[in-house]
């Protein structure tokens, strides 16, 4: 039947058998990095280029035969998925073969890293149109492996790897946690997190999104005409680079932050069941099946927005977390989340001529994530403005006072261990957009940002008593670019972003007695840019 | 996707001793790392990527593999350059034994080494 | 050499149960979709359901949904056919199909006959 | 559920000469992501499994007699087989796999005259 994974991928307006891709990836070359592959199968034969590159370790064990359908069925069968004739997703993709797994595929960093470096010096031999480099292979955590990807990607190519088979947190492999890295997760038919035998799916912050990767149809390397299905994160990987080479053919002026956004903006939301991944991990690992764009979609007017989760602050009493956006992205917001409650806040700094996110653990408490919303605006200045603790009963406020400059984003951080209960509760006054507001004992940060056309408007949600979640949606056109908690009260145990919406937690009421005057608000700072939209219509 | 902060095994070993009374060996305090898989059946020991610092000249890539060769045979150590990296990163890929490490670690220029280790088709 | 040995049918009351089972050698079993199909004496071929090479996905005719259970032992390389709340309609030879991925059927065993009467 | 409709039920035709069956789905079956039809051609011969002939409406499986050819697009599909032979006597059956419930023609038996 038409494969499910095909149309998993159409865009949710068309019926798969009605989709007919634009271009297909035709201006773009994709590298794949994996074992041989069998380059005259009728489904890849003629837009496979297989290079002379090998660097692979020697096959374990003294009886192993090396059988040529064997050696190159991994490799054949992801040739296949992304620009295969039948059940390719970039049908149009021309592919480059490099050999960096053996027979039994296993390679090793070395090998892979001599890989990158041959595609570097293809590049920068002939440049050529959009790259595409696809790593369907994960190891441990690499730090060379990882600044390797972040040099090719600083170079202008799109790596896209797979998020790892082993049911683990992604961050402990590479180079599915390279930052620069586009790394993606398995899902099946059924929209659940792939379990391959006793594993399955890596998950986790690394992961960008998700796509099919079980039961996918391909070509199989047993003979020239032969299909098999195939599991595993190297498929759902495959997938992506497809759709990233389709992406490019139709705008290849595409940065990789651009492309990123793109991929996870045009994602299905909200539709993976969370359940199969562990507690701690769920508000980590995006909600996101990969789609491709409705064909026609130029989506540059758009303003887009990503959530980035840092690391672990780990527990100590002075122990701080750092979330940061990518090179080309602009962080707009900072918050940050503490599964105890005990953190103090967060707060915008510049490192190394960058904004990033840091966020502040308490005493007693079991540590932090720093959240930052990172948005593709050009031509953005950003800064931030601080309101020292006003210790007044009216709460600490602090607006964007210079001309044209709008409001992205609230944060605060406190010294103080516990911040109590704000009595009487803070209210934002009426009439001033351009205002955060907090607790009388925090500092209030707030991003201000000038950007051609750029506006915001603050849209609030207050529950009178105490619940576990309140959420803020922005509408239709706008998006999402601050997220914030008001105003701030012991039991928030954070507030993030996800997608379009600002969600604030807060301790299980039930558990904690809260009383009814600790009101809870989620602060959501919705954005557009008239600047793009006007030039969207001019395009048209 | 944080890089820095993966959970990966670290040994920073602090050099503060002169070595072989180089005149470029690194300045007093200066630190290289270095770094292996932390699953355990995963690493390849015996193999090692020698990553040089960012600002290093191209240049410095075959001069450093071959200083580091002339002390490990001083030492009565055969070493092996399996490759210069110049296109990615400064620095090379080179066969040697583990007991060289530290000295490795002191030659000028060198930002951290990392052991090699498996990566495996998923 | 690549076969599919099917077993398990017989003679069995209506309302009673079955369990079918289809052996398979020569490929690699997990890599690829199974079907049932059935035929009835005298009549045409008639599919019965499909199970993917993971064994996550199941598809059943309207006819024998809610009563019939398809499943897959990749380590017994065996395909299996649970058959509950047995009818006379349901009398038929039973073959095993491997799929070709597409849904179409590139290798048949030589079936098994399940015949339902009381 | 998609109908598959085959005429004639069943056909006389001398030896060395041309047998065609037709076959037509109640819905398309081309999938036009890869310009595949999505139709297969079987045959059945008394006491024996089916034996895949043709898929994606055209394509012979490996080892299928270059007699058999399969021809047509969306709804309207013909078996041929260019010179009948004496061990071609059996029921033809066409299927969809272009959707679950995957559905096969009623089938069409072939005898010589």
């Known amino acids: 039947s038409i494969p499910w994974n095909l149309e998993r991928i159409t865009p949710a307006r068309y019926r798969a058998d009605e989709y007919q891709p634009p271009k297909g990836g035709s201006l773009v070359e994709v590298y794949l990095l994996d074992t041989g592959i069998q380059s005259d199968h009728r489904e890849i034969e003629g837009r496979v280029m297989v290079t002379d590159f090998e660097s692979v370790p020697e096959e374990d064990g003294t009886r192993f035969h090396r059988q040529a359908s064997k050696c190159d069925s991994h490799g054949t069968h992801l040739a296949g998925v992304v620009s295969g004739r039948d059940a390719g997703v970039a049908k149009g993709a021309g592919l480059r073969s490099l050999r960096v797994l053996n027979c039994q595929g296993k390679g090793t960093v070395s090998g892979t890293l001599i890989g990158l470096e041959f595609i570097r010096k293809s590049q920068l031999v002939q440049p050529v149109g959009p790259l595409v480099v696809l790593l369907p292979l994960a190891g441990g955590y690499s730090r060379v492996f990882n600044a390797a990807c972040q040099r090719l990607a600083r170079a202008g190519v799109v790596l896209v790897t797979a998020a790892g088979n082993f049911r683990d947190d992604a961050c402990l492999y590479s180079p599915a946690s390279a930052p620069e890295v586009i790394t993606v997760g398995a899902t099946n038919a059924q929209d659940q997190p792939v379990t391959l035998g006793t594993l399955g799916t890596n998950f986790g912050r690394c992961v960008d999104l998700f796509a099919p990767g079980e039961d996918i149809i391909g070509a199989s390397s047993d003979c020239s005409t032969c299909f098999v299905s195939r599991s595993g994160t190297s498929q759902a990987a495959a997938h992506v680079a497809g759709i990233a080479a389709m992406m490019l053919s139709a705008e290849p002026e595409l940065t990789l932050a651009e492309l990123r956004q793109r991929l996870i903006h045009f994602s299905a939301k909200d539709v993976i069941n969370e359940a199969w991944f562990p507690e701690d991990q769920r508000v980590l690992t995006p909600n996101l099946v990969a789609a491709l764009p409705p064909s026609t979609h130029r989506a540059g007017w758009q303003l887009f927005c990503r959530t980035v989760w840092s690391a672990h602050s780990g527990p100590t009493r002075m122990a701080t977390a750092v979330a940061r956006c990518a090179q080309d992205e602009e962080l707009l917001s900072c918050s940050s989340f503490s599964r105890s409650g005990k953190r103090r806040g967060e707060r915008i700094e510049a490192q190394g001529g960058k904004r990033v996110c840091r966020a502040h653990n308490a005493f007693g408490g079991e540590g932090v994530y720093a959240i930052a919303r990172c948005c593709l605006l050009p031509q953005v200045n950003c800064s931030v403005h601080t309101a020292p603790p006003a210790g007044a009963s009216m709460g600490t406020r602090v607006h964007c006072h210079q001309q044209g400059h709008v409001l992205t984003g609230c944060s605060s951080h406190w010294e103080v261990e516990d911040l109590g209960t704000h009595k009487p509760p803070v209210l934002r006054p009426r009439g001033q957009p351009n205002q955060c507001v907090g607790h009388r004992e925090a500092s209030i940060h707030a991003s201000c940002c000038h950007a051609p056309g750029l506006e915001c408007k603050v849209k609030e949600h207050g529950i009178p008593a105490p619940q576990e979640q309140v959420i803020v949606a922005c509408e239709d056109g706008w998006t999402l670019t601050g997220c914030s908690a008001l105003p701030g009260t012991s039991h928030v145990l954070g507030a993030y972003a996800v997608d379009n919406t600002c969600v604030v937690r807060s301790w299980d009421v039930s558990t904690t007695g809260s009383t009814s005057e600790e009101a809870v608000a989620a602060v959501a700072i919705c954005c557009r840019s008239r600047h793009l939209v006007q030039a969207s219509q001019e395009l048209q | 996707q944080e890089d820095e902060d993966g959970d990966y095994e670290e040994l920073v070993l602090a050099l503060r001793s002169e070595e072989d009374g180089l005149a470029d060996a690194p300045e007093h305090g200066a630190t290289a790392t270095f770094h292996r898989c932390a699953k355990d059946p995963w690493r390849l020991p015996g193999t090692y990527v020698v990553v040089l610092k960012e600002e290093t000249h191209r240049s410095q890539s075959e001069r450093t593999a071959r200083r580091l060769q002339a002390q490990a045979a001083r030492r009565g150590y055969l070493t092996k350059i399996l490759h210069v990296f110049h296109h990615l990163l400064p620095g090379f890929l080179v066969k040697m034994s583990g007991d060289l490490l530290e000295l490795a670690l002191k030659l000028p220029h060198v930002d951290y080494i990392e052991e090699d280790s498996s990566v495996f088709a998923q | 050499e690549v076969q599919l040995v099917e077993s398990g049918g017989g003679l069995v009351q209506p309302g009673g149960s079955l369990r079918l089972s289809c052996a398979a050698s020569?490929?690699?079993?997990?890599?690829?979709?199974m079907n049932w199909v059935r035929q009835a004496p005298g009549k045409g071929l008639d599919w019965v359901s499909t199970i993917s090479g993971s064994g996550g996905t199941t598809n059943y005719a309207d006819s024998v949904k809610g009563r019939f259970i398809i499943s897959r032992d990749s380590s017994k390389h065996t395909l299996y056919l649970q058959m509950n709340s047995l009818r006379a309609e349901d009398t038929a030879v039973y073959y095993c199909?491997?799929?070709?991925?597409?849904?179409?059927?590139?290798?048949w065993g030589r079936g098994t006959l399940v015949t339902v009467s009381s | 559920d998609i109908v598959m409709t085959q005429s004639p039920d069943s056909l006389a035709v001398s030896l060395g000469e041309r047998a065609t069956i037709n076959c037509k789905s109640s819905q398309s079956v081309l999938y036009r992501s890869n310009n595949r039809n999505f139709l297969g051609w079987y045959q059945q011969k008394p006491g024996q499994p089916p034996n895949l002939l043709i898929y994606?409406?055209?394509t012979r499986e490996s080892g299928v007699p270059d007699r058999f050819s399969g021809s047509g697009s969306g709804t309207d599909f013909t078996l041929t087989i260019s010179s009948l032979q004496a061990e071609d006597v059996a029921v033809y059956y066409c299927?969809?796999?272009?959707?679950?419930?995957?559905?096969f023609g009623q089938g069409t038996k072939l005898e010589i005259k």
């Open positions: 020569g490929f690699t079993f997990n890599n690829y979709a």
């Open positions: 994606w409406a055209s």
């Open positions: 299927q969809q796999y272009y959707t679950t419930p995957y559905t």
């Open positions: 199909a491997k799929d070709s991925n597409w849904g179409n059927f590139d290798l």
